[in-house]
């Protein structure tokens, strides 16, 4: 049960952490104009990885897509790309998780496979987070290295009568939504390898073996003390394992294989 | 069409107060920035304040800051500008306007209300 | 706050000759994220309401004859109009629409010679 259930949350967490870095690498508000040296702008500035906007006091807003692709920074280009394999990453772990999800039946799918599954989109989801955050981490380094500059131009060469405003551009919306949700397809892939690990069967499964002792006629066989030597009725351990079927209960109760020496 | 029509305007002593009042018609008012524009007599035009669509935002010229207020009612499609510790300098045609128009420009303007501050 | 100087006050031009009016700002109305101007131009007749000519310190308002132009950027901005009418006889108008408070220039008297 609680397998399903860290599954599960898993699951919801990565496809909200995922939507997230959609909605992130979507949006335009990447960087936002720094109101500190005009606060009483009439004209507002914003950028996102795909186009810029300017928003006027009348209301209107006015945006213009990059149409260039060689004339783009390297860091712009290599934030779009981290942002995109996140999101292919993601879409794919999603895809993936769908059908490792124990609640799902799909054929006589075994519990095996669903954690191999169950694994690979936790992976995914750990690597599209890791890229998201990276890439929002870029931009935002970019962000910081470009502001002191810019504040650095502010300061020097203003000897002349006529004053000229250097548009300093700060952390967008954006930014807190990538991060936030980076965080959330990480922490949704580590609950999916979590969970993994109670998927899977932790014991190679044997045969029924007979290991003829010298002295005694007694017939060991994997699954529990059942025989004449007097251990007697161990009723968790009932169960003869002939490597066959089990059920969806008795997942976690069989001995692991280093019972067996 | 698009219609601006002050009111309130006349004859007050100094220090006393004043309320203009402007009706919109003609566009989706509560979408739209509002300006108070003034021009004394012979003189040239002189911006008084503005206030954003949602009323988040409120500007006024130095001249009138801590006098003059503005303030709006979409859903009485009005704009007002209340006008308190008025001096004969105040003396003017008061006009309301929109930006209506890109580039943050004052496309539609009203007729005017005259507002005299005299003893 | 941002300062226009307009210059000449009042110009005296021929009918079908050109008339230039400049306005200087005290503060660069340029905005790098849309490569604009934030200069406006109005006109306003005798015992009328200003009326809008030209927005983006170039672009001009639709309905406005051609005639009108604008130009100029950063701080230098200039109003042309290039074969005066009597009906261009009036008051001319920048105004800063970049920061508050929207200051406008002082007004250039336009009359025919």
């Known amino acids: 049960m609680a397998v399903t259930a860290c599954q599960g949350l898993g699951f919801v967490v990565s496809l909200i952490g995922i939507a997230g870095i959609i909605a992130a690498t979507c949006m335009d508000q990447w960087s936002t104009q720094d109101l500190y040296n005009n606060p009483v702008t009439a004209v507002f500035n914003y950028q996102g990885l795909w186009r810029s906007c300017v928003r006027e006091s009348s209301g209107f807003t006015e945006c213009r897509g990059y149409f260039t692709l060689l004339g783009l920074p390297a860091m712009l280009q290599a934030v779009r790309a981290l942002m995109i394999v996140g999101i292919v990453l993601g879409a794919i772990g999603l895809l993936v998780s769908i059908f490792a999800l124990k609640c799902i039946r799909i054929g006589s799918m075994e519990d095996s496979a669903k954690a191999n599954m169950t694994l690979t989109s936790g992976i995914m989801f750990i690597v599209s987070g890791l890229c998201a955050i990276a890439g929002v981490s870029v931009f935002a380094n970019m962000l910081v290295t470009n502001f002191w500059m810019s504040t650095a131009n502010m300061y020097t060469g203003m000897g002349g009568m006529v004053q000229t405003v250097q548009t300093r551009y700060t952390f967008g919306a954006a930014l807190f939504v990538g991060w936030v949700a980076g965080g959330l397809t990480l922490i949704g892939g580590v609950m999916m390898c979590i969970a993994c690990r109670g998927l899977a069967p932790e014991e190679t499964n044997y045969k029924a073996v007979s290991y003829h002792a010298s002295g005694h006629s007694v017939a060991y066989k994997p699954g529990g003390f059942k025989a004449s030597t007097g251990f007697g009725s161990n009723t968790k351990n009932k169960k003869i394992y002939d490597g066959g079927a089990r059920t969806e209960d008795e997942v976690q109760s069989y001995p692991s294989k280093h019972d067996y020496v | 069409e698009v219609q601006l029509v002050e009111s309130g305007g006349g004859l007050v002593q100094p220090g006393g107060s004043l309320r203009l009042s402007c009706a919109a018609s003609?566009?989706?008012?509560?979408?739209?920035?509002m300006h108070w524009v003034r021009q004394a007599p012979g003189k040239g035009l002189e911006w008084v304040s503005y206030?954003?669509?949602?009323?988040?935002?409120?500007y006024y010229a130095d001249t009138v800051k801590g006098r003059f207020t503005i303030s709006r009612d979409n859903a009485k499609n009005s704009l007002y500008l209340q006008m308190n510790s008025l001096r004969a300098e105040d003396t003017a045609v008061y006009y309301c306007?929109?930006?209506?128009?890109?580039?943050?420009?004052?496309?539609?303007w009203g007729q005017g209300t005259t507002v005299t501050v005299s003893s | 706050d941002v300062v226009l100087t307009q210059s000449p006050d009042s110009l005296a031009v021929s009918l079908g000759e050109r008339a230039t009016i400049n306005c200087k700002s005290s503060?660069?109305?340029?905005?790098?994220?849309?490569?604009?101007?934030?200069l406006t131009w109005y006109q306003q007749k005798p015992g009328q309401t200003p009326k809008l000519l030209i927005y983006?310190?170039?672009t001009r308002k639709s309905g406005v004859p051609d005639r009108f132009s604008g130009s100029g950027s950063g701080t230098d901005f200039t109003l042309t109009i290039s074969s005066l009418q009597a009906e261009d006889v009036a008051v001319y108008y920048c105004?800063?629409?970049?920061?508050?408070?929207?200051?406008f220039g002082g007004g250039t008297k336009v009359e025919i010679k």
């Open positions: 306007a929109t930006s209506y128009y890109y580039g943050n420009a004052l496309e539609y």
């Open positions: 003609g566009f989706t008012f509560s979408s739209f920035g």
């Open positions: 206030i954003s669509s949602g009323s988040g935002s409120i």
């Open positions: 503060q660069s109305l340029f905005n790098v994220g849309n490569q604009k101007n934030y």
């Open positions: 983006w310190a170039s």
């Open positions: 105004q800063n629409v970049y920061s508050y408070p929207l200051t």
